[in-house]
Interface confidence: low
């Protein structure tokens, strides 16, 4: 950066090189150039010469004043006009930053995604600070009172192997930058209560041509958790409103859920699960699309690798879409 240049003098900022956005600031430049009594001192911001609010303080020093400085980053340097020198002589440079102290982190949430080996903690950081802001996640055992701390710039994954102080913990987050520090409320957790089952996935769908056609959705999870509650939501792609079905599930086998749907309409399905009675849900699964056949299916087309067709009797889909705005990976 500009701070690495060789200086023939000194540049400094008041109140500081990192300051609160919107403040009035003064940038001082003091020349110390051999055989030079500067005729004029110039300030440059991001390479552009400043024309206004410059005050000469004495023979070697000048001040540049900014009112309500709102730029997150700027590179400042100053030069001197020396007698008998054709070009301006560089005095010194400094990178300056403006921003905000951190907000109090809130909505602290910690979950353990099954098989991940980690406890994942997230929080709402609040407004953008514009400057380097670090977060320290404190995890304190309620049994041993031992505390561990983890530094991060956003969320944190903490190895469950390192959580050796029993099952109950307090978690809180400190946010810190050059302008201040804030601390969240403490979240009390029990490791057994924050496990989110291994992701549930819809694998395929088929519509059976019965008197009243029915669609069967096949879905599964690798979870080892015995009691799991799941929700499947579905809607016609043209609709805004989701229909939701609830299931108490034991994933020792592939789940088959039956739906009576309108013919010749494209539907979208998603599923999510939680350990029964616990607080946190999986994010909704990827969008799964299935178009129901017309009342009497004519010809069916194979979708991906799918061998279990009752020729002429079923219409099957294996279709996974990308996440969209109504497929937010929210927890809770």
């Amino acid at each position: 950066g500009i701070t690495n240049i060789n200086c023939s003098g000194h540049i400094w900022v008041e109140p500081a090189t990192i300051f609160k956005m919107g403040m009035n600031i003064s940038i001082y430049c003091q020349a110390a150039i051999k055989n030079c009594q500067p005729r004029k001192l110039h300030f440059y911001k991001n390479g552009i010469k400043e024309r206004f609010q410059i005050t000469r303080i004495n023979k070697t020093t000048a001040r540049l004043w900014y009112k309500n400085f709102l730029e997150p980053h700027a590179s400042m340097y100053c030069t001197a006009e020396c007698p008998k020198h054709f070009q301006e002589t560089l005095i010194c440079g400094k990178d300056i930053s403006s921003g905000y102290p951190p907000d109090i982190p809130d909505e602290v949430t910690c979950v353990i995604y099954e098989y991940s080996g980690n406890m994942t903690c997230t929080w709402n950081a609040g407004k953008l600070t514009y400057i380097d802001t670090k977060y320290v996640v404190h995890v304190k055992s309620l049994e041993t009172e031992e505390e561990q701390q983890y530094l991060t710039s956003s969320y944190i994954n903490i190895s469950t192997d390192s959580l050796q102080g029993g099952k109950k913990y307090l978690v809180w987050v400190q946010a810190a930058n050059a302008l201040g520090m804030e601390e969240s409320k403490q979240l009390q957790i029990h490791l057994d209560d924050i496990v989110i089952p291994s992701a549930a996935v819809i694998s395929r769908a088929e519509t059976i041509n019965a008197t009243v056609p029915k669609t069967i959705i096949y879905w599964d999870s690798q979870t080892t958790i015995e009691k799991v509650s799941c929700e499947m939501r579905y809607k016609a792609t043209t609709n805004q409103t989701w229909n939701v079905k609830e299931f108490d599930t034991n994933f020792t086998y592939v789940q088959q859920s039956e739906f009576y749907l309108e013919p010749n309409i494209k539907y979208v399905f998603q599923v999510r699960c939680q350990e029964t009675g616990k607080r946190y849900w999986q994010p909704w699964s990827s969008l799964f699309f299935h178009k129901t056949p017309e009342t009497v299916p004519q010809v069916t087309s194979k979708a991906f690798q799918h061998d279990t067709w009752n020729s002429g009797l079923t219409v099957a889909s294996i279709s996974t879409g990308h996440l969209t705005s109504d497929n937010r990976g929210d927890i809770g």
Partner: antibody
């Protein structure tokens, strides 16, 4: 400019207590934890613990949990460390210290307070 | 607690040569983002001075003669070329978890 000014040297008898102070200036006292470090003569450094002035929450190294108590006086921007039931093992220089940002190394140190335990 | 083993305990290096100090942690103190090791210089009668943070980031105002490297459990402080003023004791410290332990120190003497 951040400054940490510690109280003067102490000569105390075994079994007594001592309370060292560390007055902070040049920054918002409640925005940063204050840590304490022990250095016995000719030996390495030992982290004792820290206190978060805003909440008063303190964390200690297991080794010092029963003998050290960390407190703050927010009105005077001063942190205190009290040592109880002193023995000759507690003769050392004690430093208060502050991070730049949390856990990125102690950028700011007090000048140290020498504690001598002797009868 | 994490133990930091520093070596050598003392070191004599000729003016202008390279000094290398090692710090080994009893368990990994690194993530993909950070190496939680810091290096300090301490001169007699003075508090320690932070030289390098996060294993390799030079603290503001510290000469570029000082450099740090390493990750996981093995870390190194290099001083090159050494100057008279570098006579001091050097400590590593981890901030992975409480307690934040220090290494036993390496005393550097300039020949």
């Amino acid at each position: 400019e951040v400054q940490l000014q510690q109280s003067g040297p102490e000569l105390v008898k075994p079994g007594a207590s001592v309370k060292i102070s560390c007055k902070a200036s040049g920054y918002t006292f409640t925005d940063h934890t204050m840590d304490w470090v022990k250095q016995s003569h000719g030996k390495s450094l030992e982290w004792i613990g820290y206190i978060y002035p805003k909440s008063g929450n303190a964390a200690y190294s297991q080794k010092f949990k029963s003998e050290a108590t960390l407190t703050v006086d927010k009105s005077s921007s001063t942190a205190y460390m009290e040592f109880h039931s002193l023995t000759s093992e507690d003769s050392a220089v004690y430093y208060c210290a502050r991070w730049g940002l949390r856990r990125d190394g102690f950028t700011y140190w007090g000048q140290g307070t020498s504690v001598t335990v002797s009868s | 607690q994490i133990v930091l083993t520093q070596s050598p305990a003392s070191l004599a290096v000729s003016l202008g040569q390279r000094a290398t100090i090692s710090c080994r942690a009893s368990q990994s103190v690194s993530t993909s983002s950070y190496n939680y090791i810091h290096w300090y210089q301490q001169k007699p009668g003075q508090p320690p001075k932070l030289l390098i943070k996060y294993a390799s980031n030079l603290e503001s105002g510290v000469p570029a003669r000082f450099s740090g490297s390493g990750s996981g459990t093995d870390f190194t402080l290099n001083i090159h070329p050494v100057e008279e003023d570098d006579t001091a004791t050097y400590y590593c410290q981890h901030t992975w978890e409480i307690p934040y332990t220090f290494g036993s120190g390496t005393k550097l003497e300039i020949k």
